[in-house]
Interface confidence: medium
């Protein structure tokens, strides 16, 4: 049950509670949305986002999208539901607690991203093939 | 009705450590409904939050203290503290801890009263 | 790390009156602002969560508003116990940061 303090002071759509009943509280994640990035040919990499932000709904997890085409590389790190999609693709591995970048399909550029859900996760996005297994050609090609 | 009570030592040497402890009663510390803060304010002057440690074992520090200060949780005494290292004449203030519903993360509801720290040789 | 500044530094008022007390971010805080009452030799007390929720057990004379970047708060009608330092407090980002406050003294 809620304590009394809680249910006064709090309005009634923040509390959340998971599987087990505990609490739920809003996360801590990396939220510069779009920047420039040189984040390229890395197992890993830091998003060198200042910006730590207290997400809006406590069923957010934090987002990181890596994008690299002709002319850039950009990170997008960002608080998302993940019961919602992003960038048209469901996340799949929100309850991760670590960001381990998965490709995704997109016309004219390479296109990761991955979802984890404990505070700042998304500030280390993971490409490392010890962790992501589906596409090993994929990995060949970016570490070489 | 949970509360929060600062103590330690009001005289710190430039240099030394600075120790606080907080005393959590009327609940448990271990409350997945809590966080628990540190906030300073110098005399005459405004406020300034030290660091957080929030349920489930992850503690944020405010950047501008440069790694000095260290907050841990004793669940055994009900009891968190805060530790600053490398004091100098400006981390004089009155040390507040304080208690934040984990729901709202960043907004205290429940102060200390406050202990006054002077660094002072 | 996100700036708050509170305008008027000081409010001299009567008891009665209405004060409006405002605060602004550097940056979008959301509706992430708080707003504290803090009397000589004792710790704040909060009185407004996420711009507009009043706390628990704070008078109704006691309103907030704003979003982004400009906040509001204001006390309808003085009571003698509302003479005091306010402070707003944004949560958006990490560092939680206040701003200078306002005290709100007797005319």
């Known amino acids: 049950t809620i304590p009394p303090h809680v249910q006064k002071s709090v309005n009634n759509d923040m509390i959340v509670t998971d599987n087990n009943g505990a609490v739920k509280f809003p996360q801590l994640c990396k939220f510069c949305d779009v920047r420039f990035s040189t984040c390229d040919n890395q197992k890993s990499c830091m998003s060198n986002c200042s910006i730590t932000s207290i997400c809006e709904k406590p069923q957010e997890v934090c987002v990181a999208v890596w994008r690299k085409n002709d002319e850039n590389i950009t990170l997008e790190t960002v608080c998302h539901d993940p019961k919602l999609p992003y960038h048209d693709f469901i996340l799949e591995d929100a309850a991760s607690p670590k960001c381990i970048m998965k490709e995704k399909k997109k016309p004219g550029e390479t296109f990761f991203m991955c979802s984890c859900s404990s505070d700042e996760c998304n500030d280390n996005i993971i490409f490392s093939e010890e962790y992501n297994t589906s596409n090993p050609d994929l990995l060949l090609v970016i570490f070489q | 009705q949970l509360q929060v009570q600062e103590s330690g030592p009001g005289l710190v040497k430039p240099s030394e450590t600075l120790s606080l402890t907080c005393t959590v009663s009327g609940g448990s510390i271990s409350s997945s409904y809590f966080s628990w803060s540190w906030i300073r304010q110098p005399p005459g002057k405004g406020l300034e939050w030290i660091g957080s440690?929030?349920?489930?074992?992850?503690?944020y520090y405010n950047p501008s203290l440069k790694s000095r200060a260290t907050i841990s949780i004793d669940t055994s005494k009900n009891q968190f503290s805060l530790k600053l290292s490398s004091v100098t004449a400006a981390d004089t203030a009155v040390y507040y801890c304080?208690?934040?519903?984990?729901?709202?993360?960043?907004?205290?509801?429940?102060w200390g009263q406050g202990t006054l720290v002077t660094v002072s040789s | 790390e996100i700036v708050l500044t509170q305008s008027p530094a000081t409010l001299s008022l009567s008891p009665g009156e209405r004060a409006t007390l405002s605060c602004r971010a550097s940056?979008?805080?959301?509706?992430?602002l708080a707003w504290y009452q803090q009397k000589p030799g004792q710790a704040p007390r909060l009185l407004i969560y996420d711009a507009s929720n009043r706390a628990t057990g704070i008078p109704a004379r006691f309103s907030g508003s704003g979003s982004g970047t400009d906040f509001t708060l204001t006390i309808s009608s003085l009571e003698p116990e509302d003479f005091a330092v306010y402070y707003c407090?944004?949560?958006?980002?990490?560092?939680?940061?206040f701003g200078q406050g306002t005290k709100v003294e007797i005319k």
């Open positions: 940056q979008s805080v959301r509706s992430y």
């Open positions: 304080a208690r934040g519903p984990t729901t709202i993360r960043g907004v205290i509801d429940s």
């Open positions: 407090q944004q949560r958006s980002n990490w560092p939680p940061t």
């Open positions: 440690f929030y349920y489930g074992g992850k503690t």
